[in-house]
C-alpha cells in the first residue's frame, strides 16, 4: 500500500511513501521513513555546525547522499538543506561526516558561495555555502 | 520566459504611503528569494529589501528599516512592497528582482521594468 | 552593514582586456556577483559565485576573487561592453541582507 504524499513544504511536487511500517522503518515520530532510510526536514534555520549538532542529539546526521536509487525522493526536495558534506581543504577532497569521501557523479557540485560546507538541493546538486550561514537542514538516520 | 511585470509610476508627498507590486510569471515562484532593488535618478543601485520563498527569512538596508515591509502572495505569484513615511531621498526606480536561491542571497538574474516612484511636494 | 568599493571609471582599448575590481569585508566571506547595466536597460547578471556565467553570457567575460577583493575581467573588450558595471555580495552580517558596489562606468575607447 502506498500514500500519495504531498508535503509543499518539503518536494515540488506529490511523493509516493509507503503507509505501513513494515515496508520502511522504524524512525522516530513523525519522520520520513523511505527506502530503509528515516529522514527529517527541519525548518529552523541554524548554521552547519549547529544542524549537525541537532541531528546528533537525535541519534542522526545530517542528510549523507550514497545512492541515487535508494534515495529518488531527494529528486524532488524544494529549496536547499544542510547535508553532512564538509570541503577537506589539506587535500581538496568533500567528505561525508563519517569519514566517507563522496563518490564520483552522485553529487553535481556548484560553487555558490566561499566555503567549506555544502548544501543539498533537488535533482542531487550540492552548493557549496558558507558554513556559519543560518539556514533549514535535514536529519537522517539508517534503519539497517 | 520569466517575466517581472511591476505596478506603473506615481508620484507621493512626503510623509505619504505607496504599495508597489509585481506580478511573475514563466517560473516557479515559490522556488526563489525575490529582492526589491533601486536606483536614483544618475546614481547606482541600492538594495532596498529581500524575502525568502516561504517568506522565513526577510531582509532591510538600514535607510528603510522601521518604515517598508517586503511581503509577497505565492497563491497569486506576486510580490510586494509598502513604503510608508516617504522622504524625498527614496525617490528613484524600483526593481523587482528574483534571485538564484530559494532561502539565501545569491545573485539576481531577472529583474523587472522598474517602477519609477517620486516623492515630491 | 557592509560596504562594497569600486573604482568609479575605468577605461580599455578595443579588443584589449580590461579588469573592473570591487573591495569590501564582506568579500572576504563571500563571492560577488557581477552585473551590466546600460541606459536605460536594467541590469543584466553576467558572473556569480565562484565564475559561473548565465547562459547567454559570452565567455570573454569572467569573474575571480583574492582576500577582500572581488575582480571582473573582460578579455578582448567590444564596444557593446561599453555600460555601468555593479558588484554586489551578501552582506557580512550573514544575514538575508545583500549590498552592491557604487558602480564602474566602463569605456571602450
Known amino acids: 500500500i502506498w500514500s500519495a504524499v504531498f508535503l509543499n513544504s518539503l518536494f515540488n511536487q506529490e511523493v509516493q511513501i509507503p503507509l505501513t511500517e513494515s515496508y520502511c522503518g522504524p524512525c522516530p515520530k513523525n519522520w520520513i521513513c523511505y527506502k530503509n532510510n528515516c529522514y527529517q526536514f527541519f525548518d529552523e534555520s541554524k548554521n552547519w555546525y549547529e544542524s549537525q549538532a541537532s541531528c546528533m542529539s537525535q541519534n542522526a546526521s545530517l542528510l549523507k547522499v550514497y545512492s541515487k536509487e535508494d534515495q529518488d525522493l531527494l529528486k524532488l526536495v524544494k529549496s536547499y538543506h544542510w547535508m553532512g558534506l564538509v570541503h577537506i581543504p589539506t587535500n581538496g577532497s568533500w567528505q561525508w561526516e563519517d569519514g566517507s569521501i563522496l563518490s564520483p557523479n552522485l553529487l553535481t557540485i556548484i560553487e555558490m558561495q566561499k566555503g567549506d560546507c555544502a548544501l543539498y538541493a533537488s535533482s542531487f546538486k550540492g552548493y557549496i555555502e558558507n558554513c556559519s550561514t543560518p539556514n533549514t537542514y535535514i536529519c537522517m538516520q539508517r534503519t539497517v | 520566459q520569466v517575466q517581472l511585470v511591476q505596478s506603473g509610476g506615481v508620484v507621493v508627498q512626503p510623509g505619504g504611503s505607496l504599495r508597489l507590486s509585481c506580478a511573475a510569471s514563466g517560473f516557479t515562484f515559490d522556488d526563489y528569494t525575490m529582492h526589491w532593488v533601486r536606483q536614483a535618478p544618475g546614481k547606482g543601485l541600492e538594495w532596498v529589501s529581500g524575502?525568502?520563498?516561504?517568506?522565513?527569512?526577510?531582509g532591510y538596508a538600514d535607510s528603510v528599516r522601521g518604515r517598508f515591509t517586503i511581503s509577497r502572495d505565492n497563491a497569486k505569484n506576486s510580490l510586494f512592497l509598502q513604503m510608508n513615511s516617504l522622504r524625498a531621498e527614496d525617490t528613484a526606480l524600483y526593481y523587482c528582482?528574483?534571485?538564484?536561491?530559494?532561502?539565501?542571497?545569491?545573485?539576481?538574474?531577472?529583474w523587472g521594468q522598474g517602477t519609477l516612484v517620486t516623492v515630491s511636494s | 552593514s557592509s560596504e562594497l568599493t569600486q573604482d568609479p571609471a575605468v577605461s580599455v582599448a578595443l579588443g584589449q582586456t580590461v579588469r573592473i575590481t570591487c573591495q569590501g569585508d564582506?568579500?572576504?566571506?563571500?563571492?560577488a556577483s557581477w552585473y551590466q547595466q546600460k541606459p536605460g536597460q536594467a541590469p543584466v547578471l553576467v558572473i556569480y559565485g565562484k565564475n559561473n556565467r548565465p547562459s547567454g553570457i559570452p565567455d570573454r567575460f569572467s569573474g575571480s576573487s583574492s582576500g577582500n577583493t572581488a575582480s571582473l575581467t573582460i578579455t578582448e573588450a567590444q564596444a557593446e561592453d561599453e555600460a555601468d558595471y555593479y558588484c554586489?555580495?551578501?552582506?557580512?552580517?550573514?544575514?538575508?541582507?545583500?549590498?552592491f558596489g557604487g558602480g564602474t562606468k566602463l569605456t571602450v575607447l
Open positions: 524575502i525568502s520563498w516561504n517568506s522565513n527569512k526577510i
Open positions: 564582506s568579500l572576504r566571506s563571500y563571492y
Open positions: 528582482a528574483k534571485d538564484l536561491s530559494a532561502m539565501l542571497s545569491w545573485g539576481i538574474d531577472y
Open positions: 554586489n555580495s551578501r552582506d557580512s552580517s550573514g544575514n538575508h541582507d545583500m549590498v
